[in-house]
Amino acid sequence: EYSNCGENEYYNQTTGLCQECPPCGPGEEPYLSCGYGTKDEDYGCVPCPAEKFSKGGYQICRRHKDCEGFFRATVLTPGDMENDAECGPCLPGYYMLENRPRNIYGMVCYSCLLAPPNTKECVGATSGASANFPGTSGSSTLSPFQHAHKELSGQGHLATA
């Protein structure tokens, strides 16, 4: 019966069994509900909008890593609907902390203004390098843990076609 079905299962009236909700493909996310025994008649998959990606299944579309604005790194590979962005080396004026455990955001580049003497990425860097990349506000660089990481905004899609 309905109550026995799992998170990604719906009750199939015809077979009398719980059945897996149809998973979405890469670059898509579920639209409307399916799971715990019920499935919306118009349940389906919608494409990830620009700036977001999904590996498929029941995953929602997530925002691409902001290599330049947040990580202060170059963009190695821009993200698309199916893949996250990949960040490259630090931007000029920024350096990577060595031997620092990776956090949930991966490696983050820090301003050369805060660097210990003789940090290799900062040697020869313009003195007084700005701690803010063009396009960001005048406040100091965000700490990784001040970053609003998960974005759950909806698609605004009205179901059908």
Partner: antibody, heavy 119, light 107 residues
Amino acid sequence: EVKLEESGGGLVKPGGSRKLSCAASGFTFSDYGMHWVRQAPEKGLEWVAYISSGSSTIYYADTVKGRFTISRDNAKNTLFLQMTSLRSEDTAMYYCARRELLRYYFEYWGQGTTLTVSS
Amino acid sequence: DIVMTQSPSSLSASLGDRVTISCRASQDISNHLNWYQQKPDGTVKLLIYYTSRLHSGLPSRFSGSGSGTDYSLTISNLEQEDIATYFCQQGNTLPYTFGGGTKLEIK
């Protein structure tokens, strides 16, 4: 092979009524949402109405709301469009189209049936 | 309603050419953009769905791209059988709306 076959078109006087049908075959009709889309002579395509697989969700274009009724008979694999208070601007080729099972677009289309509203 | 503006309205090209048709939405449609081909006999077929995904069984010379409000359909290596009218359609918001169409002819 997915097949959608419209019928019921013809000449109708303004203010008159007509019921279009779309016979479906080659797939499990009761699993799929269905649409009507029309095309006036020498014009573009215009979405008309949608009905979900079990008829729980129905949408209409504002141009036909209150005059047209979409319905389906899953036992007979048939989609319908009941049209009343017909106007000359309803003159068009009417297509039925099947939604993709999981995605929101018109995956397969019928050949269309022509409705002419004229006195 | 979301207005879909397609350009050009007609296009003449030679066999083997690469052809691009553009479609602009009056607001962001988040990749809910589909392309259809209507043959001179009225037959309508889905070509591309969700901006860039080729419908099964179709030749890879058809491709789609874009994001936000601007999208395009490209036909590389144009063939005789591609003579048709092409329509874009947004599926982001009801009512679903189509572009005005691009009639493709062979020079």
